[in-house]
């Protein structure tokens, strides 16, 4: 199809070699397609629709996003080429940085439903660069925290190190949503819920002599409970003896119960004691079984592949630690009668 | 700060003998167990064999009697002979030490290569 009646808008991605992050693109038709196209079943043409780029009417969440490659060959269908970017409605996630994501990204309805629809399509020209200036060295991260319950802030990555007086218009969404009454590089959280969490969008204009662009970031905001003052639980073996058979082969289990630490470096491993001699058992890795918001509840297995009479004099421990503290319970094997 | 130097490791063929030998410098005490583990390529690490300060030793089923670990305690240094090696003792063998529950220390290895 014709792109030169696409509306054009460009957008910068300046990212950190630091840290992981990630990038969106929203399929931010014109407002009078977008009226006549993605609204059509609820507003009359003269009507003009909130600035949703990526709101929940059927039509809109049916787009196609294609790249227009730099050597001028036909457009190219996101979904077959490119495994790091992920089509979810209207939105394209970048899931990993860099320049070779710079080009030019076209979106358009999926169903062309009258001629008026053809010029319906959005060309975005996305330059990426890697963050150059140590001048500023507190940028905020692309992973924010907030603390359920309390106050809190959610800032603009590209935008953190500058005052609030001098800082550029910003335009905020929220899982994809606009957050109209949000203009400032910093979202000032009263009290911290847990609906709070989400995708975080952040854009500001940034124009030279020759033309303007969308400088944008990507905030993941996850919210979170203060750290455990706790150490952590062992909530099975639960019995200091368990009876065997011997010649059988026989897994021991240890679960335990790990509160939230924002820095979780949880520790747990099976030793053998065995009169005056304590080893580290080799076992397999360790897996999260339930995770919440409050703790994590980790399991580890010793596997015997069979139970032998040495065994029986042996002690097998189970060792968890966290940053507060450990626990230890030991098990004893005992035959069968 | 614990450290723990390994020596010994190198090319051998099928039948042959190795002594491995670890060299314990810093806060390491007499009580501790110390010991061997290895790591073949592409495997878990799994125990060799461990020695406490009086004597008791451990051994993997796999090396029983091929095997024979000792301790100077006095060097602060702990041995593994290697006899009658097959290909499948090739691995990183790693020195370890272990003070108490949570506190264990590791060399970084030295490879055995039985191989004709």
């Known amino acids: 199809f014709n792109i030169s009646g696409c509306s054009t808008k460009k957008l910068l991605w300046t990212y950190s070699t630091r840290s992981e992050e990630e990038f969106v693109l929203f399929c931010d038709l014109p407002e009078p397609q977008k009226s006549h196209f993605c609204h059509r079943n609820r507003l009359s043409p003269k009507q003009v629709p909130e600035h949703l780029p990526f709101m929940g009417s059927n039509d809109l969440s049916d787009v196609q996003w294609y790249q227009q490659p730099s050597n001028g060959d036909p457009l190219e269908d996101i979904r077959k080429s490119y495994p790091h970017i992920i089509q979810d409605k209207c939105t394209l996630h970048f899931l990993t940085p860099g320049v070779n994501n710079s080009g030019s990204y076209i979106c358009r309805p999926k169903m062309i439903k009258s001629p008026y629809d053809v010029a319906c399509c959005v060309k975005m020209i996305l330059e990426v660069k890697p963050q150059t200036n140590a001048s500023c060295e507190y940028s905020a991260s692309h992973k924010q925290d907030l603390l359920l319950g309390s106050t809190g802030s959610i800032s603009c990555p590209s935008l953190s190190c500058q005052s609030d007086a001098q800082s550029p218009a910003v335009t905020w969404y929220k899982n994809g949503k606009l957050l109209s009454v949000e203009r400032s590089n910093r979202i000032v959280v009263d009290e911290v819920y847990d609906y709070h969490q989400g995708t975080y969008v952040c854009d500001y204009t940034q124009s030279d002599t020759v033309s303007s662009w969308t400088v944008r970031a990507v905030v993941q905001v996850r919210t979170i409970v203060g750290d455990t003052k706790l150490k952590p639980d062992i909530l099975d073996p639960v019995e200091d003896t368990l009876e065997v058979e011997l010649g059988k082969p026989l897994t021991i289990s240890c679960k335990a119960r790990f509160g939230f630490e924002r820095v979780f470096n949880p520790v747990i491993k099976w030793y053998i004691k065995d009169s005056d001699l304590e080893w580290e058992v080799s076992v397999p890795e360790a897996k999260s079984i339930k995770s919440t918001l409050k703790d994590e509840i980790i399991e580890r297995n010793i596997i015997l592949e069979k139970v032998t009479q040495r065994d029986l004099r042996r002690k097998f421990v189970c060792f968890v630690q966290n940053s507060i503290g450990n626990t230890t319970q030991s098990v004893q094997l005992k035959e069968k009668r | 700060e614990v450290q723990l130097v390994e020596s010994g490791g190198g090319l051998i063929q099928p039948g042959g003998s190795l002594r491995l030998s670890c060299a314990a410098s810093?806060?390491?005490?007499?009580?501790?167990?110390m010991g061997w583990y290895r790591q073949a390529p592409g495997k878990g690490r799994e125990m060799v064999s461990v020695?406490?300060?009086?004597?008791?030793?451990n051994y993997a089923d796999s090396v029983l009697g091929r095997f024979t670990i000792s301790r100077d305690n006095a060097k602060n240094t702990v041995y593994l002979q290697m006899n009658a090696l097959r290909a499948e003792d090739t691995a990183v063998y790693k020195c370890?030490?272990?003070?108490?529950?949570?506190?264990?220390?590791w060399g970084q290895g030295t490879l055995v290569t039985v191989s004709s």
């Open positions: 810093g806060s390491i005490s007499s009580r501790d167990t």
């Open positions: 370890y030490a272990h003070r108490t529950y949570g506190v264990d220390y």
């Open positions: 020695i406490s300060s009086s004597g008791n030793t």
